[in-house]
């Protein structure tokens, strides 16, 4: 039960991960205007990875594209790559999963299978939000850089009359919901890894030990009785471990997965 | 088609206030006060997103003027204290535009600040 | 503060003249996000209420005759009239659309020659 609870947990955090990933790279709002002493400001600015905005104090928000691809600068194409390799990984992971989730049941695929399944999406998941807290530190490392260079920049070449404020750019809304998104996949990839564990069946656990059947806080234990000799293949033990799991598992653990979904 | 009507003001002494008002219909996201002296150029004087309520004000009229809109009446609102004679002139309600242009404004109402 | 200066305060011009107005800021009105000077150009007259012609500098009102035009980026902006009519004379004022707050310049009055 423990092991359905974590495995479904993990799916559901990393669902709403890579929903918060798919999210975070479709805003606009990865860098903002920075607007230090003037917290009121007529045209206020917002990039994001596929387009620039300007929002005017008159309500009117205009957005351009990026239509050039060679003309960008080489980290916001890394960004772009990062955070797309992340849903790539993600969306394909959470396809995995689904098949692997003990509570649904595929044709007779074996535990040992679904246990491959999950720790796979796992690892998916754990390599897709590393991806996108990559991807948004990389962002956020450029903006820290740039903010400094242009307040460096703000205060000189004023000797004349005529002053020119250069623009600067502090972090928005997305690079948070990037770093949130991408920890939850993460975690929940973790989860999926921890569950596959306890999924993977134990060729000689509980050979010639009925009793163990009922127990299924001992039975989903993973690593337990490793060192102990077999009796070969015990196709009856077997069918009653599983059995026994599988229906406890489908009358509790399925209305809290279509609750989820 | 956006219709802008100001009222409210009048004569009135040194020290002394006045709330002026402007009917608006039309879709209005945000709205702007802006001052004319007799024979004068145009002044700005306050701004209002008329969704929000977010505010500001030209430097020489912050603490005395208050910008101020009415939803379920759709008015917008100038309450101006402390009144000083050289803040005689005909106000306008404008309505702010693409460019944070000033595309529409009503007819102007004429304060009068004398002893 | 941004100051707008226009220039000249006024002038007299007879009609089919061409006419030009111009107007500086104290700070570009260049817009880097947009790439759009956000410079407002308006006509008043005589106890009437301004009435816009020209935004960003260059984009013309819908309603406002063809012969208006506006030039410009960041600090120097111009407004022509390419053939000057009976009912173009007035007082032009340019605004600074850029930053709060707003700020008009001083106004060019165009008289008849």
């Known amino acids: 039960m423990a092991v359905t609870a974590c495995q479904g947990l993990g799916f559901v955090v990393s669902l709403i991960g890579i929903a918060g990933i798919i999210a975070a790279t479709c805003m606009d709002q990865w860098s903002t205007q920075d607007l230090y002493n003037n917290p009121v400001t007529a045209v206020f600015n917002y990039q994001g990875l596929w387009r620039s905005c300007v929002r005017e104090s008159s309500g009117f928000t205009e957005c351009r594209g990026y239509f050039t691809l060679l003309g960008l600068p080489a980290m916001l194409q890394a960004v772009r790559a990062l955070m797309i390799v992340g849903i790539v990984l993600g969306a394909i992971g959470l396809l995995v999963s689904i098949f692997a989730l003990k509570c649904i049941r595929i044709g007779s695929m074996e535990d040992s299978a679904k246990a491959n399944m999950t720790l796979t999406s796992g690892i998916m998941f754990i390599v897709s939000g590393l991806c996108a807290i990559a991807g948004v530190s990389v962002f956020a490392n450029m903006l820290v850089t740039n903010f400094w260079m242009s307040t460096a920049n703000m205060y000189t070449g004023m000797g004349g009359m005529v002053q020119t404020v250069q623009t600067r750019y502090t972090f928005g809304a997305a690079l948070f919901v990037g770093w949130v998104a991408g920890g939850l996949t993460l975690i929940g990839g973790v989860m999926m890894c921890i569950a596959c564990r306890g999924l993977a069946p134990e060729e000689t656990n509980y050979k010639a030990v009925s009793y163990h059947a009922s127990g299924h806080s001992v039975a989903y234990k993973p690593g337990g009785f490793k060192a102990s000799t077999g009796f070969g293949s015990n196709t009856k033990n077997k069918k009653i471990y599983d059995g026994g799991a599988r229906t406890e598992d489908e009358v509790q653990s399925y209305p809290s997965k279509h609750d989820y979904v | 088609e956006v219709q802008l009507v100001e009222s409210g003001g009048g004569l009135v002494q040194p020290g002394g206030s006045l709330r002026l008002s402007c009917a608006v219909s039309?879709?209005?996201?945000?709205m702007n006060w802006v001052r004319q002296a007799p024979g004068k150029g145009l002044e700005w004087v306050a701004w209002i997103n008329m969704y929000t309520g977010e505010r500001t004000y030209a430097d020489d009229f912050k603490g005395r003027f208050t910008i101020s809109r009415d939803d379920s009446k759709n008015t917008l609102y100038l309450q101006m204290n402390s009144l000083r004679a050289e803040d005689t002139a005909v106000y306008y309600c404008a309505r702010l535009y693409n460019g944070n242009s000033l595309d529409y404004w009503g007819q102007g109402t004429l304060v009068t600040v004398s002893s | 503060d941004i100051q707008m200066t226009q220039s000249p305060s006024s002038l007299s011009a007879s009609v089919g003249d061409r006419v030009t107005i111009t107007c500086k800021s104290s700070q570009s009105l260049l817009n880097s996000g947009n790439i759009k000077s956000y410079l407002t150009w308006y006509q008043q007259k005589p106890g009437k209420a301004p009435k816009l012609l020209i935004y960003?500098?260059?984009t013309l009102r819908s309603g406002v005759p063809s012969r208006f035009s506006g030039s410009g980026s960041g600090t120097d902006y111009t407004l022509t009239i390419s053939s000057l009519q009976p009912e173009d004379f007035a007082t032009y004022y340019c605004q600074n659309a850029y930053s709060f707050p707003f700020t008009f310049g001083q106004g060019t009055k165009v008289e008849i020659k």
């Open positions: 039309g879709y209005t996201f945000s």
């Open positions: 960003w500098a260059s």
